[in-house]
Interface confidence: low
């Protein structure tokens, strides 16, 4: 089996109206507190030079970073949405734990590193921005991994 066949999520993950609504509500709440509108974390640049078959692996990297470095340190904010969305995203992360790629991941690592550096450079407002883009993270995971 090719290694990246494990880079799959069930479509049912994205068809639960309640948690989808909570994820989008969380993103909306955070985007209201985001003053930096000229920076986009999850956009065309993130996928530049990454083939369609490797995009789920890329999104796995972004998801794990978002969970560990953004959502958990900010987990006391944006209640009650945060306490419901974090376990949902953790479940998706666990489902992608065996997702790896066999080929060259240089472009992926470069793009993920750029996203991480942008968030870190912006400090806490970068974390707020990342939470404000959870709707984009959600849609990108769906598009790349289903």
């Amino acid at each position: 089996l090719p290694v990246n066949t494990r880079c799959k999520l069930e479509v049912s993950n994205f068809q639960q109206p309640y948690i989808v609504n909570r994820t989008f509500m969380l993103a909306k709440e955070a985007s209201l507190a985001d003053n930096n509108t000229d920076v986009r974390l999850i956009g065309e640049k993130l996928f530049r030079g990454v083939s369609a078959k490797d995009q789920c692996y890329l999104m796995k990297q972004v998801l794990n970073f978002t969970l560990e470095d953004v959502l958990l340190p900010q987990s006391d904010r944006f209640q009650p949405y945060m306490q419901e969305v974090v376990p949902f995203l953790t479940k998706l992360s666990n489902q992608l734990s065996s997702c790896h790629i066999s080929g060259d991941d240089q472009n992926i690592q470069k793009n993920v590193r750029r996203l991480k550096e942008t968030v870190k450079k912006l400090g806490e407002s970068g974390e707020i921005k990342a939470i404000g883009e959870l709707d984009l993270l959600f849609m990108s995971l769906r598009n790349a991994c289903v």
């Epitope: 507190a33 958990l72 904010r77 209640q79 400090g123």
Partner: antibody, heavy 117, light 107 residues
Framework: QVQLVQSGAEVKKPGASVKVSCKAS????????IHWIRQPPGKGLEWIGR????????YYNEKFKGRVTISADKSISTAYLQWSSLKASDTAMYYC??????????WGQGTLVTVSS | AIQLTQSPSSLSASVGDRVTITCSAS?????MHWYLQKPGQSPQLLIY???KLASGVPSRFSGSGSGTDFTFTISSLEAEDAATYYC??????????FGQGTKVEIK
């Protein structure tokens, strides 16, 4: 219910150090920011810094950077404020407090630190 | 860091009066929070995220405002409301700042 219990009052000489503790209970300690805030006698509230116990990440008020260390021990759900090179002007009530969203919702009872020669 | 200026710094009012305290931020903030502190006690959260009432807080307390101008109101002052009130923001990362406080006394 959420409780923050601080260590007892301290009397120190100028130039000395002090370490104040804040024992948390009633919630998941690693998941919420703990802030340290001080209040000199008869004055207002001044934010010192905060720690996210889950990762150990800290932020400090620039005014206190270098003289203050905030730490946490997840295993015993306790946060610490260590202050070095104390001055008479550091005499204050020191509070630990737990965040909720953007606010500081739960406060310890305070620890009075008196710096006097 | 964003500066918060409370007005007035102190006031004296009678039981039943409507009391208003303002908090002005040096630049725009997302939310304002309000605390009361009685002598010898720790501060207590009253209003969070500008207008939400903290658990167990009486409905005579309210908050409003946006941007740089925020207001805290006690609709009908009670004797037990004698205290110092503080506004606070956490929008200028990573700083938290407090207003200088407003002391409310009962006539």
């Amino acid at each position: 219910q959420v409780q923050l219990v601080q260590s007892g009052a301290e009397v120190k000489k100028p130039g000395a150090s002090v370490k104040v503790s804040c024992k948390a209970s009633g919630y998941i300690f690693r998941s919420y920011w703990i802030h340290w805030i001080r209040q000199p006698p008869g004055k207002g509230l001044e934010w010192i810094g905060r720690i996210y116990p889950g990762t150990g990440r800290t932020y400090y008020n620039e005014k206190f950077k270098g003289r203050v260390t905030i730490s946490a021990d997840k295993s015993i759900s306790t946060a610490y404020l260590q202050w070095s090179s104390l001055k008479a002007s550091d005499t204050a009530m020191y509070y630990c407090a737990r965040s909720y969203d953007y606010s500081v919702a739960y406060w310890g009872q305070g620890t009075l630190v008196t710096v006097s020669s | 860091a964003i500066q918060l200026t409370q007005s007035p710094s102190s006031l004296s009012a009678s039981v039943g009066d409507r009391v208003t305290i303002t908090c002005s931020a040096s630049s725009s903030v997302s939310y304002m929070h309000w605390y009361l502190q009685k002598p010898g006690q720790s501060p207590q959260l009253l209003i969070y995220e500008t207008r939400k009432l903290a658990s167990g807080v009486p409905s005579r307390f309210s908050g409003s405002g946006s941007g740089t101008d925020f207001t805290f109101t006690i609709s009908s002052l009670e004797a037990e409301d004698a205290a110092t009130y503080y506004c606070q923001q956490w929008s200028s990362n990573p700083y938290i700042t407090f207003g200088q406080g407003t002391k409310v006394e009962i006539k």
